[in-house]
């Protein structure tokens, strides 16, 4: 970890470090790293792990320093911590470091897994949960069903996974999921492998997502960051023709805001 010369925590308390518009962004986005001290400071530094000197620094005359990173590249991603200095602290003395901030600059988030709990075979009258699991917290997860153009269910989760409940009678089918950052600028994951849910007595089969006909590929999330369940028109697939909106039946549910979470 970083080891700038720091006094006891109670003496020079740690600052707060945040990123705007998000900690996960695509390359080329402008990112502001914002460091706020609990008292006026004259210099802020951003440290990388293991470094005793700041990678970036900025002189200020207030409690806040903003580092404007223009058109970020993946190389600018990584773990940052912030410290601040005051002129009366003596040479080389920095505050306690902030909590870590991980900036991820990527075109696409890693593919999630999709598993059935307790398993992909459904008994009579039993419900099943599908867990879409990524690697990042505070993401929005979307579940698709083959043959249904619109997202089947939509969940925001503080955990790196989201659970979608399927009612037993409607559960069998072929499913896929993906996740994305909850607000603009959106970064999308690859879509998971498909998962086949079957009745007891019919063996489940796994197929790559790309071979699942009629299943919508994920496009950009809703333009309104406040919307938790986008309409079909918000999900414009890349390189695929948008299917027409199907009639509102239980098999083709288009969850539009405000979000509700019916079982299928």
């Amino acid at each position: 970890d970083i080891t700038p010369s720091v006094p006891p925590a109670s003496y020079h308390p740690k600052p707060w470090l945040g990123a705007q518009p998000a900690t996960v962004v695509t390359p080329g986005v402008n990112v502001t790293l914002r460091c706020r001290a609990p008292q006026p400071a004259w210099r802020f530094g951003l440290f990388k792990p293991g470094e005793i000197a700041p990678l970036l620094f900025r002189d200020v005359s207030s409690e806040l320093a903003e580092f404007f990173l223009e058109e970020v590249t993946p190389a600018q991603g990584g773990i940052y911590r912030c410290c601040y200095r005051r002129p009366d602290w003596g040479p080389g003395v920095w505050s306690q470091p902030s909590d870590v901030l991980e900036l991820l600059v990527t075109e696409e988030l890693p593919r999630p897994s999709l598993v059935a709990l307790p398993g992909p075979v459904v008994g009579p009258g039993a419900n099943v949960s599908l867990r879409c699991a990524g690697r990042l917290r505070n993401m929005s997860f979307v579940l698709y069903r083959e043959g249904v153009a619109a997202p089947l269910q939509y969940r925001h989760s503080a955990q790196p996974w989201a659970d979608f409940t399927l009612l037993g009678a409607r559960a069998p089918g072929t499913y896929s999921c993906y996740y994305h950052t909850p607000s603009a600028p959106y970064v999308l994951s690859q879509r998971s492998e498909v998962l086949v849910i079957s009745w007891e007595g019919e063996g489940p089969e796994a197929r790559p997502a790309s071979s699942a006909p009629g299943m919508q590929a994920p496009g950009p999330p809703p333009s309104d960051p406040g919307a938790q369940a986008p309409s079909l028109s918000s999900f414009r697939p890349r390189g695929l023709v948008l299917q027409p909106l199907l009639p509102q039946t239980q098999d083709s549910w288009d969850p539009a805001p405000p979000p509700s979470d019916p079982g299928v």
Epitope: W42, L46, A53, L55, L56, F57, R58, D59, V60, S61, S62, E66, F67, F68, E70, P87, P91, G92
Partner: antibody, heavy 117, light 107 residues
């Protein structure tokens, strides 16, 4: 390309005031502090102070408090230094300089101020 | 204020010669040090920042080293266009302060 274009030479009388400008281009003006430096004839350099164009926050070298006032016009990406109650001691070349987050300074071409009656 | 003592104040050197200029700070400046070159009638130009980082476009014959209170600028093989005045600048503490300068002339 980062450029800091300063205003032309000034010849002013003692007791008067002057405003030196520094127009920035090639980067986002509000992202970096602008510093001002004095170089008297044949001498080394002295820091005057800096301004944060984003919020107008300033810090002055104690020696120049009351002598220099730093301002910015964000709409034109221009920093200004106002010098008042001029005496012959203020005759010098004044530079604006941008400091990036890594510690690299970019310099304007300088403005020569001559205070003479 | 931090005092920067630069030496020598002036020197003559031959083309191709290795030249070293030193700067001593009155306290630890944590490598927040730049080396500047100034030619007559021109503005300063930053050569080195953070003690040892070469500015893009500056010839690789220039290098900086040092830590704590002691720093140096080295020109590995002097060229004609290197003549001018060189300043060290500390920006560890405000107000930033400069060394008195080293006037480098060609023999």
């Amino acid at each position: 390309e980062i450029q800091l274009q300063q205003s032309g030479p000034e010849l002013v009388k003692p007791g008067a005031s002057v405003k030196v400008s520094c127009k920035a281009s090639g980067y986002v003006f509000t992202s970096y502090n602008m510093y001002w430096v004095k170089q008297s004839h044949g001498k080394s350099l002295e820091w005057i102070g800096y301004i944060d164009p984003y919020n107008g926050g300033t810090r002055y070298n104690q020696k120049f408090k009351g002598k220099a006032t730093l301002t910015v016009d964000k709409s034109s990406s221009t920093a200004y230094m106002h010098l008042n109650s001029l005496t012959s001691e203020d005759s010098a070349v004044y530079y604006c300089a941008r400091l990036d987050y890594y510690g690299n300074f970019y310099w304007g071409q300088g403005t020569t101020l001559t205070v003479s009656s | 204020d931090i005092k920067m003592t630069q030496s020598p104040s002036s020197m003559y050197a031959s083309l191709g010669e290795r030249v070293t200029i030193t700067c001593k700070a009155s306290q630890d400046i944590n490598s927040f040090l730049s080396w500047l070159q100034q030619k007559p009638g021109k503005s300063p130009k930053t050569l080195i920042y953070r003690a040892n980082r070469l500015v893009d476009g500056v010839p690789s014959r220039f290098s900086g080293s040092g830590s704590g209170q002691d720093y140096s600028l080295t020109i590995s093989s002097l060229e004609y266009e290197d003549m001018g005045i060189y300043y060290c600048l500390q920006y560890d503490d405000f107000p930033y302060t400069f060394g008195g300068g080293t006037k480098l002339e060609i023999k």
